[in-house]
């Protein structure tokens, strides 16, 4: 009689689908995740199922509190879709699907520098590009540790690029660019490169 | 024109076996679907059998009274789906289908068939 | 194991009536409504008309419908045409430690 009850509820929208998500939709393939599946009726003694496609993954019982399910994304078919199943009794509604999105993490941008030097400005051409990473990659442009040029958007995998001119410069700047694409808290820099603060031959970025 | 063409049906004697083929053409694999297979004895309701996905993984769904006897493979490459059934018993004379569904938890219901191949099942 | 049983397993109509199926499953079909309704003629494969309980598939005439949830479900012709004399088959699915996917043992639609 329980179950006819339950069922009975679900028809009149007192037992609805639960909601799957995770605090992570953008991950890296290794990555651990935790998926989180609740429902509004914090009352009933829900039983809670993961599944990916038709496979199931695993089975918590839960009431009031959403159950987490912990899972390492390690092949692209492990994106998803995902489904959670709340079960009361032999009454049950799924969740809307869940998927993942997994992006390869930048590696380590090179920076390369061109000049053209006049008698009285550095013309500077900046070229920043990262080999291997997920596009789009998001390029900024630094100058001794502060940001010189807006996110430079790259859907293709050609490098940034950023020009200045400067006055002939007193003392020695460094410069440094970082990559950076969907994945979240996870950007790289290149490594340093020095101007130094003269010109003539102390200037091996010059074009003569 | 999509369409799922079955063959390797015939007569086989009991304790026999036999691999069922299931050619689908005007689908890409690639797609990602559970390529199924469903049963009919004569005069007879339907029986689903088993189901593979088309993905990277393949991974396998059947029936609990198939596991065993019953093995559901693929060929991406030739866009085919086969069954290899073993110990054949006089029970399993059918008319057996080839079937697509959806690879989502919720595609649970077969949206194409086969025109089927009768297995026979005597001595 | 699910038992899908439907009535009445055999039935005479002509041609313009409402014809009614009901389908019964020994449990909730899961999420409530994953059922589904076939069609199929003698020598041929089934033809699927209808899941999720009510949703038509492409191509179905809209004298097909059905209802229900849980354990109960309908399939209801408006208007029985020529071409609708055929067997009918419900399919439930549920998920316990395997997939079931049961279907029911079928309902003749024969000309009265």
């Known amino acids: 009689r329980k179950a006819v009850l339950d069922c009975e509820a679900m028809k009149t929208n007192e037992f609805p689908s639960p909601c799957l998500d995770s605090k992570t939709k953008v991950v890296m393939k290794g990555q651990n995740v935790s998926m989180f599946c609740s429902h509004k009726n914090k009352s009933l003694q829900i039983t809670y199922s993961l599944f990916r496609r038709k496979t199931h993954l695993g089975t918590q019982d839960g009431k009031g509190e959403p159950a987490i399910f912990n899972l390492s994304i390690t092949e692209a078919h492990e994106s998803g879709p995902y489904k959670c199943k709340a079960q009361v009794t032999s009454c049950s509604k799924y969740s809307r699907d869940f998927s993942f999105t997994i992006v390869d993490p930048v590696t380590s941008p090179v920076l390369n520098i061109m000049v053209i030097q006049t008698e009285t400005d550095r013309h500077i051409t900046l070229h920043c590009l990262s080999v291997n990473g997920s596009l789009p990659i998001n390029y900024t442009f630094f100058e001794n540790h502060v940001a010189i040029s807006p996110a430079i958007s790259k859907y293709d995998r050609e490098p940034a690029e950023f020009n200045l001119t400067k006055k002939n410069p007193g003392e020695e700047e460094e410069y440094r660019c970082e990559a950076k694409n969907r994945l979240p808290n996870y950007a790289t820099y290149s490594h340093p490169v020095t101007m130094p603060s003269t010109g003539g031959d102390s200037c091996p970025f010059c074009l003569k | 024109e999509v369409q799922l063409v079955e063959s390797g049906g015939g007569l086989v004697q009991p304790g026999g076996s036999l691999r069922l083929s299931c050619a689908a053409s005007?689908?890409?694999?690639?797609?990602?679907?559970?390529m199924c297979w469903v049963r009919q004895a004569p005069g007879k309701c339907l029986e689903w059998i088993g189901c593979?996905?088309?993905?990277?993984?393949?991974?396998?769904y059947y029936a609990s009274w198939a596991k065993g006897r019953f093995t559901i493979s693929r060929d991406n490459s030739k866009n085919t789906v086969y069954l290899q059934m073993n110990s054949l018993r006089a029970e399993d004379t059918a008319v057996y289908y080839c079937a697509r569904r959806g690879s989502g938890v919720d595609d649970y219901y077969f949206n194409l068939w086969g025109q089927g191949t009768l297995v026979t099942v005597s001595s | 194991d699910i038992q899908m049983t439907q009535s009445p397993s055999s039935l005479s109509a002509s041609v313009g009536d409402r014809v009614t199926i009901t389908c019964q499953s020994s449990?909730?079909?899961?999420?409530?409504?994953?059922l589904a309704w076939y069609q199929q003629k003698p020598g041929k494969a089934p033809k699927l008309l209808i899941y999720d309980a009510s949703t038509l598939a492409s191509g179905v005439p809209s004298r097909f419908s059905g209802s229900g949830s849980g354990t109960d479900f309908t399939l209801t012709i408006s208007s029985l045409q020529p071409e609708d004399f055929a067997t009918y088959y419900c399919?439930?699915?549920?998920?316990?430690?395997?997939?079931?996917?049961?279907f029911g043992q079928g309902t003749k639609v024969e000309i009265k």
């Open positions: 449990q909730s079909v899961d999420n409530n409504n994953w």
């Open positions: 593979i996905y088309t993905g990277s993984v393949g991974e396998l």
């Open positions: 399919q439930g699915t549920y998920y316990t430690t395997d997939w079931w996917n049961s």
């Open positions: 005007g689908i890409d694999f690639s797609s990602y679907y559970d």
